[in-house]
Amino acid sequence: AIVFIKQPSSQDALQGRRALLRCEVEAPGPVHVYWLLDGAPVQDTERRFAQGSSLSFAAVDRLQDSGTFQCVARDDVTGEEARSANASFNIKWIEAGPVVLKHPASEAEIQPQTQVTLRCHIDGHPRPTYQWFRDGTPLSDGQSNHTVSSKERNLTLRPAGPEHSGLYSCCAHSAFGQACSSQNFTLSIADESFARVVLAPQDVVVARYEEAMFHCQFSAQPPPSLQWLFEDETPITNRSRPPHLRRATVFANGSLLLTQVRPRNAGIYRCIGQGQRGPPIILEATLHLAEIEDMPLFEPRVFTAGSEERVTCLPPKGLPEPSVWWEHAGVRLPTHGRVYQKGHELVLANIAESDAGVYTCHAANLAGQRRQDVNITVATVPSWLKKPQDSQLEEGKPGYLDCLTQATPKPTVVWYRNQMLISEDSRFEVFKNGTLRINSVEVYDGTWYRCMSSTPAGSIEAQARVQVLEKLKFTPPPQPQQCMEFDKEATVPCSATGREKPTIKWERADGSSLPEWVTDNAGTLHFARVTRDDAGNYTCIASNGPQGQIRAHVQLTVAVFITFKVEPERTTVYQGHTALLQCEAQGDPKPLIQWKGKDRILDPTKLGPRMHIFQNGSLVIHDVAPEDSGRYTCIAGNSCNIKHTEAPLYVVDKPVPEESEGPGSPPPYKMIQT
């Protein structure tokens, strides 16, 4: 059976403070413990939550925690449930409130010699005791002309006179604590001779050059005086007006009229009433000049049919606040319907194509009127004027694919080639009307093309296949001048492509037939052993049925390829001496020799006095310096081939001869001696 070791018990608690209702359970198996408040399950919150089996209160609340709490333990397996004894809180609290007028019903009814009752709305448990104050001074019960009823929390003044005027407040204290009134009451019982407000001037907004009227009236016995002042304390009377208020008139009833108002008349006007006794009463009102600023521009808007859209009109800054309305085709929009005005917004519901056009937002106040147009376009889904067609385009020529559509706004056209977006470059160009131009059609342009035409309302697309009509061409074109090495085997290739596979054949330019040692094998000219007579002009002819024939002319030169007779050697020279780098080459045509030193070609015309290249090709460098060290390359070339060989040059300091060494001692390394 379930047994409660600790049961919750009723207890005192303080509003807003911590509390704990204890509950401890013993049972044979696991039990689920929860709490009830007036029979309803208690849900955990940050303020009130289960702590183990007990119920913890972070801050007791007199409204939410009033009632009967019960701890419930349940064994889900056996089905047994046990409930603890009931427990509740005796919550102590005190809560501030205002001082209010209980009698008479309104302040307007307070007259001298009437009874006035004030109530202190501070409440609490246990019931607090109250203390009243006038202008911060405590009022003790039994003093003249007032009584305090603590039970009703009332202060009664009988009869009330001007001497009772002041600020009334109250405080209350109990076992819980103390609180003072959250809002105090000002009792004002007028002396008949004091000036009292009958009519107070109100702020006025007027347009420039219009008139403005301020009303002001006081009453007292005997009648009070009334005076008007402008901002700088200048009095305004019908006899003495300040220079900038020449058009001001003060009427017998106290009203002030200003005609043809100008900006300098704007400001604070003070109406001062003075009774026989008491302080002056100063009432203020402001004269504002009406103004209205310009409206911001609208961006043109594009909407889709069937949608709902809103255009907000930001009213211009102005005084008074400008009123705003929308117009279309000169007609003010209604406040309901399909196209209507809501607040400052233009609302278009279930947009139709016919809603397109110019809508105008108007703003107006006393200072004038402003307007701003917004152009609304209703987007339509593009429709076809001309779809792209499957096309045969000629290689090397410009090719065009149409994609002509119409819509509002003007549709955007993009092209795809093999599902890849075509970006405009030197080969592709998309015209304004959507047509794609391929500037010079190439064989690999033969594929699928797709164009997509879009507006905000939607898009359409179509595709077309391009077949490239290949031109008859050499692939690659044969080199117009070629060399063959004398007495060696040589081949001269020639291949071509076209719409149909072309036939290729070689012939001599003079029309003579090829010698028997020269064969034409599927376009490749084969020389088994090159002779001097093989030199000359040859023509490769490619032809097919539909495209005719094309010719390529080749001049074949027979040459003896270059070989070096003398190659430069690795050379070491003393600084200041002369270096000689020898180089001699042979071949047919006779080769020319050039030198490269330190990674630059040595130009014979710009060598300077220290360097010279001989007719036979050798390079001489006089008065060598360390910076002349490096690799030197001899390059031999003719119209048929080119060959090079290189050698390093080292420049070293001349050694100082030692005593033991005779004049005829050899240098330690191979040296050019000059």
Partner: antibody, heavy 114, light 107 residues
Framework: QLEESGAELMQPGASVKVSCKAT???????????IEWVKQRPGHGLEWIGE????????DYNEKFKGKATFTADSSSNTAYMQLSSLTTEDSAIYYC??????WGQGTLVTVSA | DIVLTQSPATLSVTPGDSVSLSCRAS??????LHWYQQKSHASPRLLIK???QSISGIPSRFSGSGSGTDFTLSINSVETEDFGMYFC?????????FGGGTKLEIK
């Protein structure tokens, strides 16, 4: 432990009241133990209908069976009852009462047929 | 409502085999999960309470494990009397819900 009433053959639209009598044992007080009701239809497994605490009359219903099942209990006879109203063929099933999870009745077969 | 999914729907075993039955919850039920055995034409019988706690009178070959959303009922060396339906049930929240069941049958 828990004795349920016998099988019932009912017409569609009728109501049926199934009883579940607890036989007392040492340390068992009928009023402080929850009686749960479970429905079993072939191919539908077990469905929890709800529960009643006889002492206080507190009940918990599965939202699915609210308006269909009503639980009552009579502490003097240690008997719990479940009334099923507006019967349809979907209500044909074995209905079990259980005290917690340990003790189950033998089940009552309710058949709804025109 | 918390949904309990049992797997497999059917398990064919030979007496002497050891088996594991799975029950998965759609959200955490902590350890508030119980296992029942039901033989044909009989009421359900509680085998394991609170995921892993044994019940007196239930053979020790039945054991349970798991917490949160994944639970297992293990039968070490199945005997012929163990064949029948097995259900899991959660008592974490209302309404209480049962799994669809696993049928343990002789191979």
């Amino acid at each position: 432990q828990l004795e349920e009433s016998g099988a019932e053959l009912m017409q569609p639209g009728a109501s049926v009241k199934v009883s579940c009598k607890a036989t007392l044992e040492e340390g068992y007080t009928f009023t402080v133990y929850w009686i749960e009701w479970v429905k079993q239809r072939p191919g539908h497994g077990l469905e929890w209908i709800g529960e009643i605490l006889p002492g206080s009359g507190s009940t918990d219903y599965n939202e699915k069976f609210k308006g269909k099942a009503t639980f009552t209990a009579d502490s003097s006879s240690n008997t719990a009852y479940m009334q099923l109203s507006s019967l349809t063929t979907e209500d044909s099933a074995i209905y079990y009462c259980a005290r917690g999870k340990l003790h189950w009745g033998q089940g009552t077969l309710v058949t709804v047929s025109a | 409502d918390i949904v309990l999914t049992q797997s497999p729907a059917t398990l064919s075993v030979t007496p002497g085999d050891s088996v594991s039955l799975s029950c998965r919850a759609s959200q955490s039920v902590s350890n508030n999960l119980h296992w029942y055995q039901q033989k044909s034409h009989a009421s359900p019988r509680l085998l394991i309470k609170y995921a892993s706690q044994s019940i007196s009178g239930i053979p020790s070959r039945f054991s349970g494990s798991g917490s949160g959303t994944d639970f297992t009922l293990s039968i070490n060396s199945v005997e012929t009397e163990d064949f029948g339906m097995y259900f899991c049930q959660q008592s974490y929240s209302w309404p209480r819900t049962f799994g669809g069941g696993t049928k343990l049958e002789i191979k």
